[in-house]
Structures are given as structure tokens and as C-alpha cells.
Amino acid sequence: HTAAQDNCTCPTNKMTVCSPDGPGGRCQCRALGSGMAVDCSTLTSKCLLLKARMSAPKNARTLVRPSEHALVDNDGLYDPDCDPEGRFKARQCNQTSVCWCVNSVGVRRTDKGDLSLRCDELVRTHHILIDLRHRPTAGAFNHSDLDAELRRLFRERYRLHPKFVAAVHYEQPTIQIELRQNTSQKAAGDVDIGDAAYYFERDIKGESLFQGRGGLDLRVRGEPLQVERTLIYYLDEIPPKFSMKRLTA
């Protein structure tokens, strides 16, 4: 009887089923929905988390100007296809054989088509802009304190290497966090910026994915930072391919 058997849960992903049947009675966890093995020492990929979310009961649930190629996730939730490593497959289809191409964070980057649609590669999202508006406070937050607190959050809570937090911008009440991570920069074991952004998004919405941890309590010099709106823009290494019809709509 080991400590692992007493607390066989996944600290970084509550949407798992765990059992102490690994070597020496160690805890082995699998994601809901996909049954895929999950590494509980790091963040779970967004694809597996979305798949788990879709399998769960429904009631369980100086500022930068985004470039013309920035994508916003307007399509909402869907049940994704994940590859054996837990990444999004480049082509996603629904039950009615409508298909589309996605980027590495699972956001649609082409018009929808049929089963003949080809998505040659999974295009990497290398730049994420998280745009937040905080609730009114007595005064503006100190920019350097805010910067330090958000960098600490991404480093400690989401285990994202500090070099991937490119900048924190602030013009009250808007905060922008820029995450950048090129394919060449991401080493084995590095948390993906897309996964970190997704965990952050869920935290901000009060839907923490962490097991047993309290919700996100963001404070800057003791002052609560309460977010009332979040917008996330995704920039891909290759610009998306939408028809002019969509762009002029």
C-alpha cells in the first residue's frame, strides 16, 4: 500500500480516470473521452481536454492591434480528433461529414468543406494574444507589478518557460498578454503556449482544470484582479485560408 494508492488523482487534470496499477502501485491516469495516457506532471494537451469536456455530462461545465490574420475561436466547442500524441489532427470533421482544417490550438483556419477537403499539415500557432478587461478598481494597477504577477502565474501555475511570455501590456482597464513560441524554440518537455492559454482561459472563467486546487486568485500587491472579459487571438506560422466571402461578411 503506497502513498500513490492513497491519492491516485491527476494534479494537473481533473478530467481523468486514475488507478494505482502502474509499476510499484503508482498512479496511472487516462483522459476521459479518449482513454489516452496523461502525464500528470505537466499540462494536458488542449485536444484531449476538449475531447474530455465533450464526453462529460453537459452540466459539468501600449496595446497590440491583432494582425489581419489573427484568428478568434468563434466556433466554440466541438469533439476533436486527436493524434496518438494528443495533438489536434489537421483535419477535423463533424458527424455530418463537414470538414475543416485547424491550427495547433484546434481553431478553424479554413472554410468548411466536405470529406474531400485536404489539410496537408498541422499549422503551428506561434503567437497568442490574450486580451483581458479587468473590473473597475480604485486606481490603475502598477504596470511592472502586474507584469511580474502574470509572468509568475504562467511560470508557476502553468509551468510555461518565462521566455515564451513575450510581453505584458496594460492600458487600464485592458491587459494584453503575448505568448510566442516558434516550432524551433519549443524543446521536448516544454509546455505549449496553446495549452497554457487554454488552462488560463478556463481558470479565468472559474472552470479550473487542476485537481482539487482552489480557483484562480489573481492579486497584484494584494489587490484582487478580477477579469470581466477575455478575448484570445491566435496567429499561425502560415496565414489562414478563408474565402473573400467570409472576409467581407
Epitope: 500513490a4 502502474g22 509499476p23 503508482r26 498512479c27 496511472q28 495516457a37 502525464d39 506532471s41 500524441e85
Partner: nanobody, 121 residues
């Protein structure tokens, strides 16, 4: 990219023996913990045996303890599973996997396609 290729499976009579091999490439094998897992027809993946990177620490599932032996040759980037006293319930696809062990948790992150072992008279 990570590649794991198993071989050595086949049809064997109850009580017989087989030696499985797994050739690894695309990652530093000598610093990776490894495991054998199996999947019986219609069942989920079951962990069978584990060996650490140096080969100094091994673990076995209760169902195979005393009958199976895991080993590795880091100079050849190869993992082995010696299976003795085989039983009908050992029939499965055997896959080698790159593994990770902490004080409390265990996970596999890459698997080979597998080799079929059938134990039948």
C-alpha cells in the same frame, strides 16, 4: 521522430517461451525509461513490465511476475521481454513504450505498433 518497432511474436503452446525485441530510434534511448504493455483482444492496454534507463530497476505486473523478464541493451538501442511459462491468458498484442516514472505517477508517451503473441495448443 520517436520510433519503436517490436518483433519476436508468434504462436506458442502453453508452457512455452518467446523473446520479444523492440528496436528504438529517434530519441536518446539510453536515458529513457521503457515498458512493455499488452492489449488482449477486446480489452484495454495493460501495463506488463518496466525498466529504468540504466537497467538497474525493474517492475512487473502481478500477472506475469516470476515468468517474464525485462532487459535492455543500450548499446543496441533495444528493449527485450523474455516470456516463459506462457499461458492462454497471455495472448495479446505486445507493445513497447517509452515511459516516465515519478514517486507517485506513471505514464507512457510513445508506443510501438506491437507484435502479436498467441498462446494456444
Amino acid at each position: 521522430q520517436v520510433q519503436l518497432q517490436e518483433s519476436g511474436g508468434g504462436l506458442v503452446q502453453p508452457g512455452g517461451s518467446l523473446r520479444l525485441s523492440c528496436a528504438a530510434s529517434g530519441f536518446p534511448f539510453s536515458s529513457a525509461d521503457m515498458s512493455w504493455v499488452r492489449q488482449a483482444p477486446g480489452k484495454g492496454l495493460e501495463w506488463v513490465s518496466y525498466i529504468n534507463a540504466e537497467g538497474s530497476k525493474t517492475y512487473y505486473a502481478d500477472t506475469v511476475k516470476g515468468r517474464f523478464t525485462i532487459s535492455r541493451d543500450n548499446s543496441k538501442n533495444t528493449l527485450y521481454l523474455q516470456m516463459n511459462s506462457l499461458r492462454a491468458e497471455d495472448t495479446a498484442v505486445y507493445r513497447c513504450a517509452r515511459a516516465k516514472l515519478t514517486d507517485t505517477h506513471y505514464v507512457e508517451d510513445y508506443w510501438g505498433q506491437g507484435t502479436m503473441v498467441t498462446v494456444s495448443s
